[in-house]
Interface confidence: medium
């Protein structure tokens, strides 16, 4: 399928001009290669009319140009002084020949309808309203005013000043005058449909002295706005329907042959295909709202329509806005797993992609909630503190420069199952959605900490050990101290690393962390985890309480921990005042200040796929073949 996209059908009238925009994928080659516009003949040949190399055909001389906009990945063909001879089939495309990548465009030029010379033309979109201005002479001020619609042989009354109204205009037509001006009356017709199109006559007075004015009302289906988006990226439909429908229910639907199937509305309806990846956000009191869809799929391409009606469903005669969405399969957004599986008590590490050109952007992780219009409260961010209910079990690790940041969630429960979004305050296309599935654990966890009831005594030495299976032998083990700004990695000692790499004794694989001397600030959550380079794997968490020594007793660490960790000389002492490297939290988490919600996401986040490296079906992380370096972490 060609990745070039443009308008399928372009229509205009004789003498007017058109502007045709064609989109191409964001690559250096595409930005610099030849762009062309050609006309398709009966033989299948496509004859160039204009190209970015400077070619201009005789028939377009003086009335057409082609402009490339590499920063937008678009080029535009402008054609003026259209005639019905311009009606035909065309291609816009890229390449050195006209057989390159292209998109078919049908251009249709209609004749201008013949109208009486003094006709005033009003052009309106379906569902909108029109106010027709009808001037008259002062002597006709006391006379009857009326508006009628011309049919072939007669003029059918729409409304008059004696309050007569045609049944098909009841509740839609109003005849009025403004202030003290006695030389003009107005007729307003609302909820316009195609049926309202045609010729009208305003009249004041009767007989030869009557004032008459011809009016031509054109009611058009709005031209669809073109949206060119990458596979797995996100799209925002910005819908502006006007103040008159501000209080009506809003909807977004997708055209399906004769009908428009509602995808989401403000009354709570949502298509299951969009579960976890859609939000509808009322913008203001002027009838504006937006719909955000992340994780675009091939099948999302198509014709969309937004509108407003009390039913939350499409209704004739109500304003609409339309889009044609093209999903480019040559996506720059990496293909990641969209479902991550974890087990109760276990952990998941979710790799969130972001635009590598924006490594300094603020990173966020939010949980999609489908109630109401859908919203996504931020749970953690590079400058957003972890939400209280996730204390000790959620952290974001930013790895500047490599296009990925990692979110780790441990102590999983079935309540954690659901949809989550990775997003930044930068390139909104890189908004990704992952579904977290949590199954009941059927076996012991891979990582176990001893002692399990960890209480350290002030001023003494305290050691905790993390046991790991042989399959993690070659991976890097770490301990980190959790705070609501992240998890700060601490020096630790890997017992297993000293063994021969040929055999692996399951009982002696452990990584220890020592606090010496214990201070009150050491109280809190600690994580033990494994990672391979910048790829984070499983974690487990433990809360260490700190208490004062009770009189007449000395505190002893549980023997099972010390039995495996009698390497005091080799263990590194952790100074409890280690400075934390993370960004300090700020009260306002960037663009999502309101209740930390990604509600008005408009166009500032994107897409959905995740690679939960620690989250395969059985809770294991990816194995690694890299050599383990024998040193203290």
């Amino acid at each position: 399928k060609s990745p070039i996209f443009g308008p399928q059908e372009v229509s205009s009238i004789e003498g007017d001009s058109v502007s045709i925009t064609c989109y191409y994928p964001d690559t250096s080659v595409n930005r610099h290669t030849r762009k062309y516009w050609c006309r398709q003949g009966a033989s299948g040949m496509c004859t160039t009319l204009i190209s970015s190399n400077g070619y201009l055909s005789k028939e377009y001389s003086g009335r057409a140009n082609l402009i490339n906009f590499p920063e937008n990945n678009t080029f535009v063909i402008n054609i003026e002084q259209l005639t019905q001879d311009d009606t035909g089939s065309y291609k816009c495309g890229l390449g050195t020949s006209n057989r390159g990548l292209s998109f078919d465009v049908s251009l249709e030029v209609s004749q201008v309808p013949e109208l009486p010379s003094d006709t005033h033309v009003y052009t309106k979109d379906i569902g909108r309203n029109v106010t027709i201005e009808c001037p008259f002479k002062r002597e006709n001020a006391p006379s009857k005013k009326s508006l009628c619609k011309k049919t072939n042989q007669s003029c059918e009354l729409v409304i008059d000043s004696t309050e007569k109204v045609n049944p098909s205009y009841i509740g839609r037509a109003k005849l009025f005058m403004k202030g003290t001006d006695l030389t003009v009356f107005y007729v307003n017709i609302s909820h316009l449909t195609h049926n309202d199109a045609g010729l009208y006559i305003c009249q004041a007075g009767e007989g030869p002295s009557a004032d008459k004015k011809n009016v031509d009302l054109q009611v058009l289906a709005p031209e669809p706005e073109l949206l060119y988006k990458d596979l797995r990226s996100s799209v925002t439909f910005e819908c502006d329907l006007g103040r008159e429908v501000a209080n009506e229910a809003k909807y977004l639907c997708r055209m399906n042959k004769e009908t428009c199937d509602v995808i989401i509305n403000t009354l709570g309806k949502r298509d299951p295909d969009f579960e976890g990846r859609i939000l509808i956000t009322p913008k203001d009191d002027n009838g504006r709202f937006s719909v955000l869809i992340t994780g675009l799929r091939k099948e999302d391409a198509g014709h969309y329509q937004c509108g407003a009606h009390s039913s939350g469903l499409p209704q004739e005669g109500w304003p609409i806005q339309t889009w044609q969405l093209f999903v480019n399969e040559e996506s720059t957004i990496p293909n990641r797993r969209s479902v991550v599986k974890g087990v109760t008590g276990g952990s998941v590490a979710i790799a969130c992609p972001y635009n590598p050109k924006e490594s300094s952007s603020l990173k966020y992780w939010c949980r999609w909630e489908g109630d109401g219009n859908g919203h996504c409260p931020v749970l953690v961010g590079t400058q957003a503190q972890v939400q209280e209910e996730y204390e000790g079990r959620l952290a974001l690790f930013d790895q500047p420069g490599n296009g990925t940041y990692t979110v780790i969630l441990n102590q999983l429960t079935t309540e954690d199952a659901g949809f989550y979004w990775c997003l930044t305050n930068g390139d909104s296309r890189w908004r990704t959605t992952i579904e977290l599935q949590v199954a009941e654990a059927t076996r012991e966890p891979n990582l176990e900490v001893t002692p399990q009831n960890a209480t350290a005594v002030l001023g003494e030495t305290f050691t905790v050990s993390c046991h790991y299976p042989c399959k993690f032998y070659s991976q890097e083990k770490y301990w980190c101290k959790w705070s609501n700004k992240g998890c700060h990695i601490l020096p630790s000692h890997d017992e297993g690393a000293r063994q021969s790499s040929v055999s692996c004794d399951q009982s002696s694989q452990l990584v220890s962390m020592t606090l010496n001397p214990v201070s009150k600030e050491d109280e809190g959550w600690y994580w033990c985890g494994v990672k391979q380079g910048q790829t984070y794997g499983e974690t487990t968490a433990i809360y260490i309480a700190v208490e004062e020594r009770t009189r007449g007793s000395s505190h002893v660490n549980p023997t099972d921990a010390n039995a495996r960790a009698k390497v005091a000389l080799e263990e590194e002492v952790v100074d409890s005042s280690i400075s934390e490297k993370e960004n300090k939290a700020i009260p306002n988490p960037g663009p999502f200040a309101n209740e930390r919600e990604i509600q008005n996401v408009g166009d500032q986040a994107q897409e959905n796929r995740a690679s939960g490296d620690a989250g395969s079906a059985d809770g294991q992380s990816r194995s690694s073949s890299s050599k383990h370096h024998h040193h203290h972490h």
């Epitope: 399928q8 059908e9 229509s11 009238i13 019905q84 009606t87 089939s89 078919d104 049908s106 249709e108 030029v109 209609s110 004749q111 201008v112 309808p113 013949e114 109208l115 619609k149 011309k150 049919t151 072939n152 449909t193 195609h194 049926n195 199109a197 045609g198 010729l199 031509d216 054109q218 009611v219 058009l220 289906a221 004769e258 004739e316």
Partner: nanobody, 125 residues
Framework: EVQLVESGGGLVQAGDSLRLSCAAS??????????MAWFRQAPGKEREFVAS????????DYADSVKGRFTVTRDNAKNTVTLRMNSLKPDDTAVYYC????????????????WGQGTQVTVSS
């Protein structure tokens, strides 16, 4: 380009019925973006509007002379538009043309951009 082909014309008696069909083909990217209409031209007269139908069939319009006797319908799945003519009169004798437009407009102001070749309807008394 769009090709419009009419069919169904013929010779009938006054009071009879006839059904004209118009099939759209060629590069019709989506038939439902065209408003459709029927016009007719009697010998020695100008072409006149008969009936029109909007994109999805929601709105129709008729010349006063055929109101109540003629019905226009469309089937977007089949790219066809039909004119059902009942109680035919000798005055209905003409060549009937199918037409399409990008804008739906009622009556004579229907802005045609494609015409069919026409089909002859003759009503004898």
């Amino acid at each position: 380009e769009v090709q419009l082909v009419e069919s169904g014309g013929g010779l009938v008696q006054a009071g009879d019925s006839l059904r004209l069909s118009c099939a759209a083909s060629g590069r019709t990217l989506s038939f439902d973006t065209y408003a459709m209409a029927w016009f007719r031209q009697a010998p020695g007269k100008e072409r006149e509007f008969v009936a029109s139908i909007d994109y999805n069939g929601g709105s129709t319009d008729y010349a006063d002379s055929v109101k109540g006797r003629f019905t226009v319908t469309r089937d977007n799945a089949k790219n066809t538009v039909t004119l059902r003519m009942n109680s035919l009169k000798p005055d209905d004798t003409a060549v009937y043309y199918c037409a399409s437009a990008r804008y739906y407009r009622s009556g004579t102001s229907f802005p045609v951009n494609y015409w069919g070749q026409g089909t002859q309807v003759t009503v004898s008394s």
